[in-house]
Amino acid sequence: KSSNEATNITPKHNMKAFLDELKAENIKKFLYNFTQIPHLAGTEQNFQLAKQIQSQWKEFGLDSVELAHYDVLLSYPNKTHPNYISIINEDGNEIFNTSLFEPPPPGYENVSDIVPPFSAFSPQGMPEGDLVYVNYARTEDFFKLERDMKINCSGKIVIARYGKVFRGNKVKNAQLAGAKGVILYSDPADYFAPGVKSYPDGWNLPGGGVQRGNILNLNGAGDPLTPGYPANEYAYRRGIAEAVGLPSIPVHPIGYYDAQKLLEKMGGSAPPDSSWRGSLKVPYNVGPGFTGNFSTQKVKMHIHSTNEVTRIYNVIGTLRGAVEPDRYVILGGHRDSWVFGGIDPQSGAAVVHEIVRSFGTLKKEGWRPRRTILFASWDAEEFGLLGSTEWAEENSRLLQERGVAYINADSSIEGNYTLRVDCTPLMYSLVHNLTKELKSPDEGFEGKSLYESWTKKSPSPEFSGMPRISKLGSGNDFEVFFQRLGIASGRARYTKNWETNKFSGYPLYHSVYETYELVEKFYDPMFKYHLTVAQVRGGMVFELANSIVLPFDCRDYAVVLRKYADKIYSISMKHPQEMKTYSVSFDSLFSAVKNFTEIASKFSERLQDFDKSNPIVLRMMNDQLMFLERAFIDPLGLPDRPFYRHVIYAPSSHNKYAGESFPGIYDALFDIESKVDPSKAWGEVKRQIYVAAFTVQAAAETLSEVA
């Protein structure tokens, strides 16, 4: 059967029919339905939503929809013993306590089971001591404190502002600095955009608002007790002392009203420069400890949260492919939220729901995709990407043999300015071509393409007339598919203007104020940005599942490999003497990149010319494209990060959210001038160059003619 026969309608008409079926009004309705109560992982509320989604996906027409459950380590506050932070006087009396909950937003006063703000997986403890302000608690902030300012955090409680990097990295850095507790807070400089009112009158964070979130350093492990394997009924679980990625010191988040009370008394050193000052009316002194009059006062944390093995539920829907049912294109996003999930995740889940409905409508009319499409509603993403990772661990053998692509679908919006895409270079051309066919929702771009508004508002720093597409990092459910399994992955959402809005993420992220009304009143009243994101995500899935030849361009990988090789070489060249002393050469890497470029070019020529009516040759060429991403996987993984196995990309060791290129070499070079054994350190650089060069060369050879 040809693809057209199998799928009933001409490919062009299919895509148009699919896109035309997507409706903004439906996304709005679904978002409302998904956000009326909290859906915290491991609760009955979230299980009921899983069953509802299962039922509705079946109604929409999917071939099968199953729940996949796992028993994973989660973390919750003690219901009868709340977490808080105090200022205590010399007698140990609590003279100030932080709030125990966020004031509920209007209309939600009677909602039960709103989990109070907490740092998931914090150990229990009641440390007390002097405070040190550590800015964003980034690697460079601790370098500034320890190396330049000679401030010792050992035995101190540190207070860090949210933003710039993943909170788990902040906690890891504080632990390494010897801190005995961490207080995380949202500074208005990062979470209050000028000229906008706070919720409920605008989209800014009120003083009592607090960002929840996990503080793990899992490095892709999934469930902390079952790394590498699914947390099923017969799983062998590690003891809590051997669990992966758990923090060792108590951590708690607060809002800026409470932060003001702690920071206003700070003494000790002045902030080193203006980049350490936020927007509160406090001196931003680093400490340690409080100033003169308050020097005998201390800070005490009271943390009573518990870690519990809890059952979670993924929803997995299948739309069987007509021609290549053993090739899987996956669209997945999470369902669990910290509270109402108005943006994270339900703005994404509502879009997935509408995409499923549209595909189901086509299927009911007799159409099927060429390849199988899997739809996933992941659980426990907020607790460390657990649902997606456990499912991928359970199905890894199928996925590594059959996985064509994974498209992520968390929050559809983090702003309403322009499109934001992070993906494998293999998908660049797919994204470009698709966005040229879609209408821009942006004001001032009526009748223009999405590609045009996106390129104008977010231009590529390298190529004029093209939009910026970023590297994949982590902090979301694509991680296991891309970083561990090497399945081509991508994500798209609408974002803010990063040039004018310097705050981190969106202000109400992971707070109780992330409601349906936030989206409907302030971000996307017409749901036109949601619809556009649905068209991009859905359109990508459609093309990946239905095009006769996979819409991957290996030449784009060649271009970025050269760029990344140049970048890492220039970093290394900051140490010319050592490179000479230790005979460090990048020749092998540049040679491999050159070979990759030439072989990719020849492969692309063959791709234009081959006989697409020959199913064996077609399948062979498509397999070479599918397995190219897989070829960048090193089975041994990165040093000390066995589940980050992609040699070209990994989450930054300093910020899980960010992607790093040639991460093995990058980490080997990082802060190399401070290493006690330079010979060993430069030896590791050489080894990482060798691994990268070999991997690029090996990947190139998968594109060579097979015989």
Partner: antibody, heavy 121, light 107 residues
């Protein structure tokens, strides 16, 4: 269809023990716990405790602690409630009810038909 | 322990009447309250969970609401099959406690 089927009526002497069973079907047994509630003749309802078979955790009403033991058999999807040192005021209908195993739940959704326990000398 | 005070203990009403039953919690229980219906010789059946959510298959004439620690079950138009005893149940904190019950009888 979710069903909780309880064992038959029992007549016991004071000081004896009774063990009531509750066989579950129509759902994944380990995804839920079982609560036990009793109702004395003509009286209201009284919560005795609950057990979660996946974790093996039990939570007892202090009033019954030391006299009650709740257990489960995952292989047969059956929950048991044993009450010892029976007194005449333990005469009641004993119900099992399903409860979701999670941090937040909505308490008892499906109930067994009840088991009458009569304590009489 | 949290006390649940239910009123009235009994009421007589006719088919088609609007019936209201209340429960007061001795302390804050949020919205962690269910309403159960029990007919003579039968097991209780849950009608409403989390203060106001109807269980599947429960007619829409049943509704629940909350004002602080006061909870109300309303039957908008009493039907013959609604004559039964109704209990509230708080599950905010252990031990879970029930109201004393309200017997709805035919006038």
């Amino acid at each position: 269809e979710v069903q909780l089927v309880q064992s038959g009526a029992e007549v016991k002497k004071p000081g004896a023990s009774v063990k009531v069973s509750c066989k579950a079907s129509g759902y994944t047994f380990t995804s839920y716990g079982i609560s036990w509630v009793r109702q004395a003749p003509g009286q209201g309802l009284e919560w005795m405790g609950e057990i979660f078979p996946r974790r093996g955790n039990t939570y007892y009403n202090e009033k019954f602690r030391g006299r009650v033991t709740m257990t489960t058999d995952k292989s047969t999807s059956t929950a048991y409630m044993e009450l010892r040192s029976l007194r005449s005021d333990d005469t009641a209908v004993y119900y099992c009810a399903r409860v979701f195993d999670g941090y937040y739940n909505y308490a008892m959704d499906y109930w067994g038909q009840g088991t009458t326990v009569t304590v009489s000398s | 322990d949290i006390q649940m005070t239910q009123s009235p203990s009994s009421l007589s009403a006719s088919v088609g009447d609007r019936v209201t039953i209340t429960c007061r919690a001795s302390q804050d229980i949020g919205s962690s309250l269910n309403w159960l219906q029990q007919k003579p010789g039968k097991a209780p059946k849950r009608l409403i969970y989390a203060t106001s959510s109807l269980d599947s298959g429960v007619p829409s004439r049943f509704s629940g609401s909350r004002s602080g620690t006061d909870f109300t079950l309303t039957i908008s138009s009493l039907q013959p099959e609604d004559f039964a005893t109704y209990y509230c149940l708080q599950y905010a904190s252990s031990p879970y406690t029930f109201g004393g019950g309200t017997k709805v009888e035919i006038k």
